[in-house]
């Protein structure tokens, strides 16, 4: 993801007693929370790999880039970053790898400048539908988020709740139409089996969508038509067997699109003919010369671009009377 990193400015580390002594009071302008490093020049605070169990209360008001990675946060409650005065400058927040399993409604409220949020590598079993919108109104105040990084947020299989993980994530993305301004959405490595059909239509500003390393089998019910600004669509390392005419036409109609399709188990039978024809003509697929068949066995490792219609046959389906057991 593109979270900003700090400049080479000097970082100050606070003595542990300093933060605890004044945590009940408004933070001093140059104060740095215990177990964190701060650079006022770079407007950056790093609390990294410190096993923090809560978001520090005494974050400096100047913070623009906040790294809270590699901690033991477990839960982000409502208003986890609400402060007096508010953290009005906070633009980039990285919470990756902090063992979060629960993000509650309104967790990111009172962050008026928050543009980049990274929750990757947290087992988010309980992501509130209102985590990003902050309210359960049918139309919420627009979120300032432009980039939302949610790679590898699926809990291990034995730790999931009894509900659709895809549905839970999509509910949070669509609640209150708060994320209409979102330009980058990364959802890689989440074991998604399907993409709910309404999700993309309600994120019209998307420029970059990463769905790589999931388990998507089909895009038949997914519409890309409204995503006129989409520049990159990452679908590598899924379980896609073929792209059908409707999907091909929609992708071809997007003016700025680059599509990445490597490492999918393409089925090279008669249903693949339209996709092969399209691949030969289109410029939108990056690395299209690397796409190869996985099935049927006789076609394994054949390059899609080198196939012709005679190669793409379907075994005839025998009528029941001619089938043998």
């Amino acid at each position: 993801s593109s979270s900003p990193t700090s400049s080479a400015s000097s970082f100050s580390s606070s003595a542990p007693f300093l933060a605890s002594a004044v945590s009940a009071q408004p933070p001093l302008p140059d104060q740095c929370p215990a177990l964190c490093e701060c650079s006022e020049a770079a407007r950056t605070v790093k609390c990294v790999n410190r096993n923090l169990t809560e978001v520090p209360t005494d974050l400096p008001a100047y913070v623009r880039n906040l790294f809270l990675t590699g901690n033991q946060l477990a839960v982000l409650p409502a208003g986890a970053f609400a402060r007096r005065p508010p953290l009005a400058e906070l633009a980039a927040l990285n919470l990756s790898g902090s063992r979060l399993d629960e993000v509650r409604a309104g967790a990111f409220e009172h962050l008026p400048s928050l543009r980049q949020l990274d929750l990757s590598h947290n087992p988010l079993a309980d992501l509130s539908p209102f985590a990003f919108s902050g309210s359960n109104a049918s139309v919420s105040a627009p979120s300032p988020l432009v980039e939302l990084i949610l790679n590898h947020i699926v809990p291990p299989e034995d730790e999931r709740q009894n509900r659709s993980f895809e549905g839970m994530v999509v509910a949070a993305l669509l609640a209150g139409r708060a994320l209409q301004g979102l330009r980058r959405l990364e959802l890689a490595s989440n074991h998604f089996l399907y993409l709910p059909r309404d999700v993309l239509a309600q994120l019209p500003s998307l420029r970059h969508l990463d769905l790589s390393n999931n388990s998507l089998v089909s895009l038949t019910y997914v519409s890309f038509r409204n995503l006129t600004h989409l520049e990159s669509l990452h679908l590598e390392d899924n379980a896609l067997k073929v792209l059908h005419n409707g999907t091909l036409a929609e992708l071809q109609g997007l003016p700025h699109i680059r599509v990445f399709l490597d490492n999918n188990p393409w089925v090279c039978d008669c249903h693949m003919a339209d996709m092969v024809t399209w691949l030969k003509e289109t410029e939108v697929v990056q690395g299209k010369d690397r796409l190869t068949c996985a099935y049927p066995e006789k076609m394994r490792n054949r390059v899609l671009l080198e196939l012709n219609s005679a190669d793409l046959d379907c075994d005839p389906i025998l009528p029941p009377s001619l089938q043998t057991s």
């Epitope: 096993n51 839960v75 629960e102």
Partner: nanobody
Framework: EVQLVESGGGEVQAGGSLRLSCAAS????????MAWFRQTPGKEREFVAA????????RYAESVKGRFTISRDNAKNTVYLQMSSLRAEDTAVYYC???????????????WGQGTLVTVKP
């Protein structure tokens, strides 16, 4: 309601180790956090450590950091407390607890075991 059963307590010399276990009668899906508390006569129960069932986040009381390790085995519905470098002041009845919050307060936890006694000889 979840039944919690502690085991593994006993007598040990200062500097020694013990491992406590807490077995839950079923996976307490309504309880997201498992914790250990301890109590000595005439004092309130004191938070020792906690772990999340999902994700495995952990937290510790300052007094045990670096000496005690909490862990969980989801397949066995069991939580462990590995205690090393034990001191006389660690002597107490150790209680297992289950709750929703990610907290250190007694009131954050709704289900409790009966306790197991740990005695550390100087």
């Amino acid at each position: 309601e979840v039944q919690l059963v502690e085991s593994g307590g006993g007598e040990v010399q200062a500097g020694g180790s013990l491992r406590l276990s807490c077995a839950a009668s079923r996976r307490p899906f309504s309880s997201k956090t498992m914790a250990w508390f301890r109590q000595t006569p005439g004092k309130e129960r004191e938070f020792v450590a906690a772990v999340r069932w999902i994700g495995g986040a952990t937290r510790y009381a300052e007094s045990v950091k670096g000496r005690f390790t909490i862990s969980r085995d989801n397949a066995k519905n069991t939580v462990y407390l590995q205690m090393s470098s034990l001191r006389a002041e660690d002597t107490a009845v150790y209680y297992c607890a289950a709750g929703q919050a990610w907290g250190t307060k007694f009131t954050d936890y709704s289900d409790w075991g009966q306790g197991t006694l740990v005695t550390v000889k100087p």
